[in-house]
């Protein structure tokens, strides 16, 4: 058992031309949150397939309103890590999907609205207990920078979190055959808890709950000798100590039966007894029938009852695949008109219409300014289906109800003081700085290509030299 941890460092426009429009604005403030989905192995599965290793959702980030004049390309992020606990062994190779979601905080009916801004995916190898791995992924014009790691929860240790550690019973050394648990010098590797009933003499395990047999023994608990009549067995050399024949390699050694089949010897070879749903010499053929319930997500199974008769899943709306295991992205058909936002709720599609439009598919054009009043002397501007208030100086917000504070976003750099002015804002720069926003030091200290930080540097304004 353990925890996969994800730390988002930044989310903003990637380098180069074509930077995306800010997802938030003065009229539509918003905040970000993130979702991570993990799957074992280097799977190429669809984004909608189950997050078999787990999933997590971040907290909401700070509310962001775009400020003209001092743009913030990287959007403010939620605090803390995203943590995905895993109960079993860490697989070592995994696939991830990280989604960036926007929560709009306008005064829309029914509370805040969510929309997917960006989705990145990748496949990685990662040992548990290792250092943070850094990554940069791009989705369209957006760039996401993040770090991740997998760590084991005590008492588990190791690269797969399958070895167990316990405090030492003796102060100086660990028990027979048990190693110290690096880096926990005061702990020892604990014997694994094998499957209940696993023979302590003839069985062992490398993973918890497993029972693997020593040579010469078989059965689920390693209690059955490979040949029960070993003293009369036609195989193997004679044992001088017992007078019995020690079993040599047999046809069932290594269990040739796949998919959980059990092996029994026959006079000439072996025979596999297959579990339900499989058949063939080695249980390698899937004989799934409708009785096994192979259709997911409410799919209707049609087919014969015998293993040779294939089944067919008839999928409900919104799902596809031979077992109805894949969710159809019904929004890809762009059913919402006039720039409406499509939401696939699973049981139904919903369109979130832009201001000025209505209807199940946003097909009705409304009079943008009808019944809309702009406060504090603002005037309503119609156009493009978006009701908009042009606010008088000193006011902002969707309906001009908010008193604008141009200094709220700390627009003056390097400790400059911000003053609200009838025309906007004015920065009074600290000594040694200039520029409309005090962003330029007049004389950076030092006489080389790597100067020391200027004397006016504030803790909030760290320097980076290349």
């Amino acid at each position: 058992a353990g925890v996969f941890e994800l730390q988002i460092h930044s989310f903003g426009p990637g380098p180069g031309p074509g930077a995306p429009r800010s997802p938030c604005s003065a009229r539509l403030p918003c905040r970000l949150f993130f979702r991570v989905c993990l799957k074992p192995g280097l799977s190429e599965e669809a984004a909608e397939s189950p997050c078999a290793l787990g999933a997590a959702l971040s907290a909401r980030g700070p509310v962001y309103t775009e400020q003209p004049g001092a743009p913030a390309p990287d959007l403010p992020l939620p605090d803390g890590l995203l943590q995905v606990p895993f109960r079993d062994a860490w697989p070592g190779t995994f696939s991830f999907i990280i989604e960036t979601w926007r929560e709009e905080l306008g005064d829309q009916i029914g509370g805040p609205a969510w929309s997917l801004l960006a989705r990145v995916a990748g496949r990685r190898r990662l040992a548990a207990g290792g250092p943070w791995a850094r990554d940069i992924q791009r989705a369209g014009a957006w760039e996401l920078r993040f770090s991740y790691r997998a760590r084991c929860e005590p008492p588990a240790v190791g690269t797969a979190c399958t070895r167990l550690c316990r405090p030492r019973s003796a102060p100086s050394r660990c028990g027979p055959g048990l190693r110290p648990c690096a880096p926990l010098e005061d702990e020892c590797e604990a014997p694994l808890v094998c499957r209940a009933g696993c023979s302590p003499e003839h069985g062992f395990c490398e993973q918890p709950g497993e029972c693997r047999c020593l040579e010469g023994w078989t059965g689920p608990l390693c209690t059955v000798p490979v040949s029960t009549s070993s003293c009369l067995s036609p195989r193997g050399p004679s044992s001088a100590t017992t007078g019995c024949l020690v079993p040599g390699p047999g046809p069932c050694d290594g269990n040739p039966c796949a998919n959980g089949g059990s092996c029994s010897e026959t006079p000439r070879s072996f025979e596999c007894t297959c579990p339900r749903g499989f058949y063939g010499l080695r249980c390698e053929v899937s004989g799934v029938t409708c009785a096994d319930g192979p259709c997911f997500n409410g799919g209707l199974c049609v087919g014969g009852a015998d293993p040779d008769s294939a089944y067919i899943c008839h999928c409900p709306p919104g799902f596809q695949g031979s077992n109805c295991e894949k969710r159809v992205d019904r929004c890809s058909l762009q059913p919402c008109r006039n720039g409406g936002l499509c939401l696939d709720l699973g049981h139904a599609l919903r369109c979130r219409c832009r201001a000025g439009f209505a209807g199940p598919r946003c097909e009705h054009d409304l009079d943008d300014c009808a019944g809309r009043a702009c406060a504090n002397g603002g005037t309503c501007v119609e156009g493009g289906g978006a009701h908009r208030c042009s606010c008088a100086l000193g006011f902002g917000g969707r309906d001009c109800r908010e008193r604008a504070d141009p200094c709220a976003a700390r627009p003056c750099a390097h400790g400059g003081r911000c003053y609200a002015h009838f025309s906007g804002l004015v920065c009074a720069c600290a000594p040694g700085y200039m520029g409309a926003r005090c962003e330029f030091p007049v004389h950076p200290d030092g006489a080389s290509a790597l100067p020391a930080a200027p004397p006016g540097l504030r803790p909030g304004d760290p320097q980076r030299y290349l």
């Epitope: 930077a19 390309p73 750099a413």
Partner: nanobody, 117 residues
Framework: EVQLVESGGGLVQPGGSLTLSCAAS????????MAWYRQAPGKKRELVAG???????MYIDSVKGRFTISRDNAKNSVYLQMNSLRAEDTAVYYC???????????WGQGTLVTVSS
């Protein structure tokens, strides 16, 4: 991480012209306030010209009317067009960027401009 690479320096005669380029990577220049600084031998580094994120420009008195700072968002670069060059303009010219969101400052490695006959 924003990285800045300057180019365009060289030897030029008094009265001549040069254009310095600063290519940025790691962030779009339209989100950065950027500037050119210079450092003559034995002197402190000084601000020459700056262009804010909102596009407003500023110059020190000694270069006003001779130097022009500009930005090309498509090429993710900032330029310093230097005309009527004088011997006192000889210096290593450095590109500077201020990233508003992180409030970090970044420097390039510099390019040498020599004005001499």
């Amino acid at each position: 991480e924003v990285q800045l690479v300057e180019s365009g320096g060289g030897l030029v005669q008094p009265g001549g012209s040069l254009t310095l380029s600063c290519a940025a990577s790691g962030s779009s220049v339209k989100f950065l306030s950027m500037a050119w600084y210079r450092q003559a031998p034995g002197k402190k580094r000084e601000l020459v010209a700056g262009i804010s994120a909102d596009g407003s420009t500023m110059y020190i008195d000694s270069v006003k009317g001779r130097f022009t700072i500009s930005r090309d968002n498509a090429k993710n670069s900032v330029y310093l067009q230097m005309n009527s060059l004088r011997a006192e303009d000889t210096a290593v010219y450095y590109c500077y960027a201020y990233r508003w969101h992180t409030r970090y400052t970044y420097w390039g490695q510099g390019t040498l401009v020599t004005v001499s006959s």
